[in-house]
Amino acid sequence: CKAMHVAQPAVVLASSRGIASFVCEYASPGKATEVRVTVLRQADSQVTEVCAATYMMGNELTFLDDSICTGTSSGNQVNLTIQGLRAMDTGLYICKVELMYPPPYYLGIGNGTQIYVIDPEPCPDSDF
């Protein structure tokens, strides 16, 4: 397994609708045709696998139908969007990129993007 550099923003604030987007950029050492992107979340001692997508260079990322993630790719950049976030989902979201094909296998892990999620205040009842 060979190492590869992955860059991602340090901090992102989710929108009031619970949507957060960030770019994950990897320094591809070769001409990979099959790339796998995984989003991991770390909060204290818990590390969970949030979502993953494999794509062929030049094609769209495909996440599972029930995934909370969507994304697009452009060259060595992946634009990731995570939706349905609530305050309890605040944490460090790590971008992991694997060049699956052709060999050799490369692995790159970003330093993580701290996503802050603030639940919107409920609208006060208004009398008309």
Epitope: S45, E49, A52, D66, K96, E98, I109
Partner: antibody
């Protein structure tokens, strides 16, 4: 070379407590979570919980809350799991385990296991 | 919690024949991870992130699947493959392992 060396087998009486140790070497102890897994005789593997040695924050499987307590001693690079109020159902081999890389190759390293026997 | 059910519970295979172990999750998981355990030994990481072979694992092994259904396959079983195989998920806590599949050689 990463090594996780656990304390030896224990025989305890019902109601007693036991503290199992896991001495880590070959890496920076505070860089990786330490997880604990139980295997009862002839049974599958059961995740007990884990501890972040840096922050000492813990996460437990609800099933083991109140039964297991995870701690670390950073000065000796040792993780501990204490089991309280032992009963026959706690007879098992207990393993400590660590990931291969940060965020990759989960549970790549395992201790040799510690057999805990409960007998009156 | 996510329950992982493995099938079959045990299988007996002749050397050189293929073998397949399934792991079904009670809800969708991102990846499945596999461990091999031999009697009296600690489990060993065997396949992680669904399809990546751990260091030293022969390429007769492969892993595949997505969502709730995952498979570990051996193209040609050898004597050293005997043992119990467990699947594991890391999509949500508590982390859970499968029920285990014992592979024996005929």
């Amino acid at each position: 070379e990463v090594q996780l060396v656990q304390s030896g087998a224990e025989v305890k009486k019902p109601g007693a407590s036991v503290k199992v140790s896991c001495k880590a070497s070959g890496y920076t102890f505070t860089d990786y979570n330490m997880d604990w897994v139980r295997q009862a005789p002839g049974a599958s593997l059961d995740w007990i919980g884990n501890i972040n040695p840096n922050s000492e924050s813990t996460s437990y499987n609800q099933k083991f809350k109140g039964k297991a307590t995870l701690t670390v001693d950073k000065s000796t690079s040792t993780a501990y799991m204490e089991l309280s109020s032992l009963r026959a159902g706690d007879i098992a081999v207990y393993y400590c385990t660590r990931d291969g890389n940060r965020y990759d190759a989960w549970f790549a390293y395992w201790g040799q296991g510690t057999l805990v026997t409960v007998s009156s | 919690q996510i329950v992982l059910t493995q099938t079959p519970l045990s299988l007996s295979v002749s050397p050189g024949e293929p073998a397949s172990i399934s792991c079904s999750a009670s809800s969708s998981v991102t990846y499945m991870h596999w461990f091999q355990q031999k009697p009296g030994q600690s489990p060993k990481s065997w396949i992680y992130s669904t399809s990546i072979l751990a260091s030293g694992v022969p390429d007769r092994f492969s892993g595949s699947g997505s969502g709730t259904d995952f498979t570990l396959k051996i193209s040609r079983v050898e004597a050293d493959d005997a043992g119990v195989y467990y699947c594991q998920q890391r999509t949500s806590y508590p982390l859970t392992f499968g029920t285990g599949t014992k592979l024996e050689l005929k």
